[in-house]
């Protein structure tokens, strides 16, 4: 197989014919050293998936349900290119499966038992697989056959294409369960009509269905969406209130050696030459000998799936939960309203040790999951492999963009017993220099910089945001002569100053000696000119408070703060000499786990929080000898957020704006994936 050949998998004679035409037309427009198409014919999409996994083919386009099959072991395929619909300016690559109800009804998602339901059709994604998959564990036992369990759950339904003889209740609202438009309640518009006519109480459809059927906003306002957290939202808030986000049609490839760049190069060229309204002789998104051959006829083009986006992230936690429930038919033994153990995400092995000790002391109420970077931990929380972790504000922003929510804030200044109910204003992000140097905020160019990590508040977002507005470009590695900013590209000058050890050099976790607040300060002490940290860092690591060899003899008066007006002040005056106020670190979780995480953590801190005085012979949640493991060591308590329960409200408008501006310079692959 030539290096630059993409072997496309076709699943019928008609697809194979179109594939050959695709191959021939691409040959005519691409240079001889460009990508080429070869065609491989298989009997089914599942056979194509297996062929790609076995390196007998390279690519195929799949519906969401098959993307799930492709991702499962031993296939391990991943999404590489997505079809989009709508316009190039506003490309739609996903749709949202929603539960629509009338505004004047008064039930929530957890009160659907005994209601009347309207479905698009048996076995269809938005109308059946997703809602029934998510409700699966609430269905009466035995749950097989599924249709019988659903019939016994709702008091009556319309499920087009169901067997009305065996399951008459599923056809109660549409006698005969007709499987075509002859049934007035068939498909998306039909299911919505079933609700509109008053036959059913809830309709399971796509987010766009209501807009396609009700042009008038006043009419739409008579309806609401049921959210998974047992609240309701208006129909235009579907991005924040849906059952699942479903990818429309996706090209998949091998996770390793999958030729994803070549596939993108090929499809990008293909859409330029043979996309919508591009060519008369061959059209990529048209199927003269059938329907949706190789690609959907309704597609308008392709978008490259960000490299950080694996199948789990692409399909989403809700979709995978629904499909897994349906396929595997397993439900937890515990009632669903009881909190299961919370899986904490620990960064690298130092945090894992502390988490393990916490787990033992919590009698298993806390379990531990590990990842090498904060972004990997956030991804694990998104896909359900972990449940929660505490994050710096910069990562609260990324987590929020990825659909996670803040649950509790770390408080640093409020003494107990008021701590748990107090919303603190935040801490100061400062620039620290040695008293002996002549540095000011205005002459940092060419100096050596020390940062907590890329993407963190005090160490990166605030100082680099301020710097960006001064220099108007993102080449921070050219502004400083060298530095240590863990998480930077390994060959960047901003990794040059890092201490490692070697394989962990510049990694954004505690294996890198200059990571975090203490690490950045150590970098200043040993090699750097300026450290970007929190205002408490110098006092916490001087005067013998940090017993480590590098810190035990340090004096607070040997360090000063840089003020934005070009002056310098004592480290005792952060209120009058700081770069900005930073939001406190916060615990984040998935929405569905937020209440359990909050309840458990408040309970845990009563046992292991700052009320424990002897940490040498007791487990202390907020102690790790200046290393800020799992939580900042200066945490007094975890505090309730009250109404600051979204990332925007928690971080505040000003900080969100600053980080959004800095996104031009973003090196966050996760943020790129979450905003796809």
């Amino acid at each position: 197989v030539p290096e630059k050949s993409v072997r496309w998998c076709a699943v019928s004679e008609h697809e194979a014919t179109k594939c050959q035409s695709f191959r021939d037309h691409m040959k005519s427009v691409l240079p001889s050293n460009g990508p080429s198409v070869a065609c491989v014919k298989k009997a089914s999409h599942l056979d194509c998936i297996r062929a790609i996994a076995a390196n007998e083919a390279d690519a195929v386009t799949l519906d969401a349900g098959l993307v799930y099959d492709a991702y499962l072991a031993p296939n391990n395929l991943k999404p590489v290119v997505a079809e989009f619909y709508g316009s190039k300016e506003d490309p739609q690559t996903f749709y949202y499966a929603v539960a629509v109800v009338k505004k004047d009804s008064d039930f929530q998602m957890n009160q659907l038992r005994g209601r009347k339901s309207c479905h698009t059709g048996l076995g269809r994604s938005a109308g059946w697989n997703i809602p029934i998959g998510l409700l699966y564990c609430d269905l009466p036992e035995p749950r097989k056959p599924l249709e019988k369990a659903v019939a016994n759950f709702f008091s009556g339904s319309c499920v087009p294409c169901a067997d009305g003889t065996d399951f008459p209740q599923l056809c109660q609202l549409c006698p005969g369960c007709g499987c075509s438009t002859l049934n007035q309640y068939f498909s998306y518009s039909g299911a919505f009509k079933c609700l509109k006519d008053g036959a059913g109480d809830v309709a399971f459809v796509k987010h766009s269905t209501i807009f396609e059927n009700l042009a008038n906003k006043a009419d739409r306002d008579q309806y609401e969406l049921l959210c998974l957290d047992n609240t309701r939202k208006s129909v235009d808030e579907y991005k924040d209130c849906h059952l699942a986000r479903v990818p429309s049609h996706t090209v998949v490839a091998r996770s390793v050696g999958g030729k994803e760049d070549l596939i993108w190069e090929l499809l990008n060229q293909a859409q330029e030459h043979f996309g919508k309204d591009k060519s008369k002789e061959f059209q990529l998104f048209s199927s003269p000998h059938g329907k949706d051959l190789l690609f959907k006829d309704s597609a308008h083009g392709f978008l490259k799936v960000p490299p950080r986006m694996d199948a789990k992230m692409y399909l989403g936690y809700e979709y995978i939960t629904a499909i897994r429930n349906l396929r595997e038919g397993t439900c937890p033994e515990a009632p669903t309203d009881e909190c299961k153990p919370v899986k904490w995400c620990a960064l690298s092995h130092h945090e894992r040790l502390k988490c393990d000790e916490w787990s033992v002391n919590s009698a298993g109420k806390i379990e531990c999951e590990s990842a090498e970077t904060t972004e990997d931990c956030i991804a694990k929380i998104m896909n359900g492999e972990a449940d929660a972790m505490s994050l710096d504000g910069g990562f609260v922003y990324i987590a929020g963009m990825c659909g996670l929510v803040p649950v509790l804030a770390e408080n640093y200044n409020t003494p107990n017993p008021n701590c748990e109910n107090t919303a603190e204003e935040g801490y100061f992000a400062v620039a620290v220099v040695k008293s002996s140097s002549d540095l000011t905020w205005d002459n940092l160019k060419g100096k050596k910089s020390c940062h907590t990590a890329v993407g963190r508040t005090a160490g990166w977002n605030i100082p680099m945001g301020l710097l960006y507005s001064k220099i108007n470009h993102c080449r921070f590695d050219e502004f400083f002569s060298e530095g240590c900013a863990p998480g930077s590209e390994k060959n960047s000058s901003l990794c040059k100053l890092c201490m490692g050890p070697s394989p962990n050099l510049c990694e954004p976790n505690n294996k890198e000696g200059y990571y975090g607040y203490t690490g950045a300060f150590r970098c200043l002490v040993e090699k750097g000119d300026v450290a970007f940290v929190k205002h408490q860092t110098v006092p916490q690591n001087t005067g013998g408070k940090n017993p480590d060899a590098w810190a035990k003899n340090l004096k607070e008066e040997d360090y000063e703060l840089l003020c934005l007006d070009g002056s310098r002040k004592s480290v005792q005056e952060p209120a009058n000499c700081h770069l900005a106020r930073a939001p406190n670190h916060a615990v984040v979780a998935r929405k569905d786990k937020a209440d359990c995480v909050q309840t458990l953590l408040l309970d845990q801190q009563r046992m292991f929080g700052s009320s424990v005085t002897d940490c040498s012979s007791n487990f202390c949640l907020f102690e790790s000898k200046t290393k800020d493991l799992l939580f900042r060591d200066d945490t007094v308590c975890l505090a309730k957020l009250h109404d600051r329960n979204t990332y925007e409200k928690y971080l505040g408008e000003e900080y969100v704006k600053a980080v959004t501006n800095l996104r031009k310079c973003s090196t966050s692959p996760l943020l790129e994936a979450c905003t796809f």
Partner: nanobody, 117 residues
Amino acid sequence: EVQLVECGGGLVQPGGSLRLSCAASGSIASINTMAWYRQAPGQQRELVAGITRGGSTKYADSVKGRFTISRDNAKNTLYLQMNSLKPEDTAVYYCTDYSRGYYQDYWGQGTQVTVSS
């Protein structure tokens, strides 16, 4: 600082039993949490079982019902009773008391357990 020395490992057939001991050089009465970890070739070190001073225990899912952790403060010893051993239990087993903080790498020699027919 208390030193810990593991022993009791060996070669055992699937279904067999072993009892690991971890002897401390000083008093463990004031040590809150003690634990057994294991590391198989090419794998990360993982928590097998832990016990607090008050006797609260936690086990990895893979060993629940087969392994039992206990401590004898009078003898300054931590134990791990391993029954119904499986080939996948093959690893070097280490004990720790977390008392040196989480940051230093302070593992002892460990004791090798091999489960094979």
